[in-house]
């Protein structure tokens, strides 16, 4: 009679995380008696996965009923596979011994590879806002995937970016991997509505890559442009001066009027108009009583935007001259701002 052989027909098995792995094993003889055991790995540090004789292995079920007459099928199923289950599994026949069973024959082993999907990419931008023409860094992270091969791309508004660096860790063999990428993006004034997208492609995703996004509205600060103009006389000895605050983002803005350097009024931008590019416009009015001034008046519109140092624009009001429309030469576009009288 030929000596018992342990046959593991599959050199390798590939299973998606969360699924059930079937590890096949058959013996060629019913003799000798003794239990089958399954191990992950070889040598003294091997891990017991299943023992036919005793023990409780909740994730493991046998494919066949081992109590069946003439059974020689010792295949097992391992449920709810995770990347940590990857490794080489050996089906080992033991011969009955006293007091302990003796290892008799081992199968050649089956390598279990686990395909695990990457986690949804998380894109994070800089901690502080930056202004147009500045370069900012975005990071993208995804974890828990296997095998190691993965592709990461960056896009800004659908256009692929090229200035980025990517690392996959660890470098050596592991049950699962992580990817970390940093992309550099140059901001423009039109980027309030822009998006930066990190796209991850992996064999487990079947051609449907995962995407993580960051809105540049969280990153960009577009400083305002100021224009101070004098409006036509509204009443004898009264002059209307407006401060047009244009193309700013985010909305957080405080405006202060100064008359000859003295604070006249402070207000916070509330009812603003939004431009197509996502920036805001706002207009503030100041009614100046000319008769109250003997000398020329220097009116200053001072704006503190998003906690940044104040910017200002001044306008000289000649008291000696008969009130008429005066103004700075700044070209003003017709913004359709929501104008408010301020008294």
């Amino acid at each position: 009679e030929e000596e018992l052989q342990v046959i593991q027909p599959d050199k390798s098995v590939l299973v998606a995380a969360g699924e059930t792995a079937t590890l096949r094993c058959t013996a060629t003889s019913l003799i000798p008696v003794g239990p089958i055991q399954w191990f992950r790995g070889a040598g003294p540090g091997r891990e017991l996965i299943y023992n036919q004789k005793e023990g409780h292995f909740p994730r493991v079920t046998t494919v066949s009923d081992l109590t069946k007459r003439n059974n020689m099928d010792f295949s097992i199923r391992i449920g709810n596979i995770t990347p940590a289950d990857a490794g080489t599994y050996y089906c080992v026949k033991f011969r009955k011994g006293s007091p302990d069973d003796v290892e008799f024959k081992s199968g050649a082993g089956t390598e279990l590879s686990v395909r695990a999907k990457p986690s949804a990419p998380v894109v994070s931008g800089p901690a502080a806002r930056a202004t147009p023409q500045h370069t900012v860094s975005f990071t993208c992270e995804s974890h828990g995937f296997s095998p190691r091969d993965i592709t990461l791309k960056w896009f800004k508004n659908g256009n692929e970016l090229s200035d980025f660096q990517t690392n996959v860790d660890p470098v050596g063999e592991s049950v699962s991997y992580s990817i970390h990428s940093t992309a550099k993006v140059v901001l423009t004034r039109e980027d309030v509505h822009s998006q930066v997208i990190c796209e991850v492609a992996h064999v487990t995703l079947q051609g449907d890559p995962l995407r993580g996004t960051a809105n540049l509205s969280e990153t960009i600060r577009v400083p305002p442009t100021l224009e101070v103009t004098q409006q036509p006389v509204r009443a004898e000895n009264q002059v209307n001066v407006t401060c047009q605050v244009r193309k700013f983002y985010p909305q957080r803005l405080q405006l202060t009027w100064l008359e000859n350097g003295n604070v006249s009024r402070t207000e916070t931008a509330s009812t603003v108009t939004e431009n197509k590019d996502g920036t805001y416009n706002w207009m503030s009015w100041l009614l100046v009583n000319v008769s109250a001034h003997r000398d020329d008046v220097k009116l200053t519109c001072q704006v503190e935007h998003d906690g940044q140092p104040a910017v200002s624009k001044s306008h000289d009001l000649k008291v000696s001259a008969h009130p008429k429309e005066q103004g700075s030469n700044t070209a003003a576009e017709n913004t359709g701002s929501n104008e408010r009288n301020i008294y």
Epitope: I31, V33, P35, D65, T67, K68, N70, P99
Partner: antibody, heavy 122, light 113 residues
């Protein structure tokens, strides 16, 4: 040491009852083993009585003549096998052996107790 | 029920003899047969399982063969300690048919010639 030790035998009157025990040591009951009772009347051959799966299922099997009168059971926490014998007859007089059936029984009865004598007589 | 018939019921032999004992099952039991040796006042001892598997610690002069309904136990060279009674047993199990059978044969007494 791996062994089986029977107890509970003795003299009993016809129609009486007796419970035999078999304490296992050196191994744990599991579904890999069937635990069995075999008897041998004085000067006669071996006669199979009953077996029980020593694992979770605890399924039991009886010789046709033993069904209804004999009940096999086990307590895995105590690693002990039992045989409850009711309505005993003179022909039940025998040495009762406890045995371990290896590999679901297919591997033969590889471990035996020393036996306990049951005498049914008035 | 499955019946096991052993023959001969007794035999006389000398040390060094080749001894053959046969066992017949009333229906096919594949290779699910065991052989035991029993000496007076002692519990039986397993010699052969699955018709031909030699139990650990049993001398190699004992061998088993057969399948289906006809089985043989052979002692290639009888030794003084081999004089005893030998039993065959069906170890059929129940899972396929519900027909659990662990019946023993009637025994064969091997005596000194």
């Amino acid at each position: 040491e791996v062994q089986l030790v029977e107890s509970g035998g003795g003299l009993v009157q016809p129609g009486g009852s007796l419970r035999l025990s078999c304490a296992a040591s050196g191994f744990s009951f599991s579904s890999y083993y069937f635990m069995c009772w075999v008897r041998q009347a004085p000067g006669k051959g071996l006669e199979w009585v009953a077996c029980i799966d020593a694992g979770y299922s605890g399924g039991s099997h009886y010789a046709s003549w033993a069904k209804g009168r004999f009940t096999i059971s086990r307590d895995n926490s105590k690693n002990t096998l039992y045989l409850q014998m009711n309505s005993l007859r003179a022909e039940d007089t025998a040495v009762y052996y406890c045995a371990r059936a290896y590999e679901y029984g297919y591997g033969g009865y590889d471990l035996w107790g020393q036996g306990t004598l049951v005498t049914v007589s008035s | 029920d499955i019946q096991m018939t052993q023959s001969p019921s007794s035999l006389s032999a000398s040390v060094g003899d080749r001894v053959t004992i046969t066992c017949q099952a009333s229906q096919s039991i594949d290779s699910n047969l065991a052989w035991y040796q029993q000496k007076p006042g002692k519990a039986p001892k397993l010699l052969i399982y699955r018709a031909s598997g030699l139990e650990s610690g049993v001398p190699s002069r004992f061998s088993g063969s057969g399948s289906g309904t006809d089985f043989t136990l052979t002692i290639s060279s009888l030794q003084p300690e081999d004089f005893a009674t030998y039993y065959c047993q069906c170890t059929y199990g129940s899972n396929d048919s519900g027909n659990y059978a662990n019946a023993f044969g009637g025994g064969t007494k091997v005596e000194i010639k």
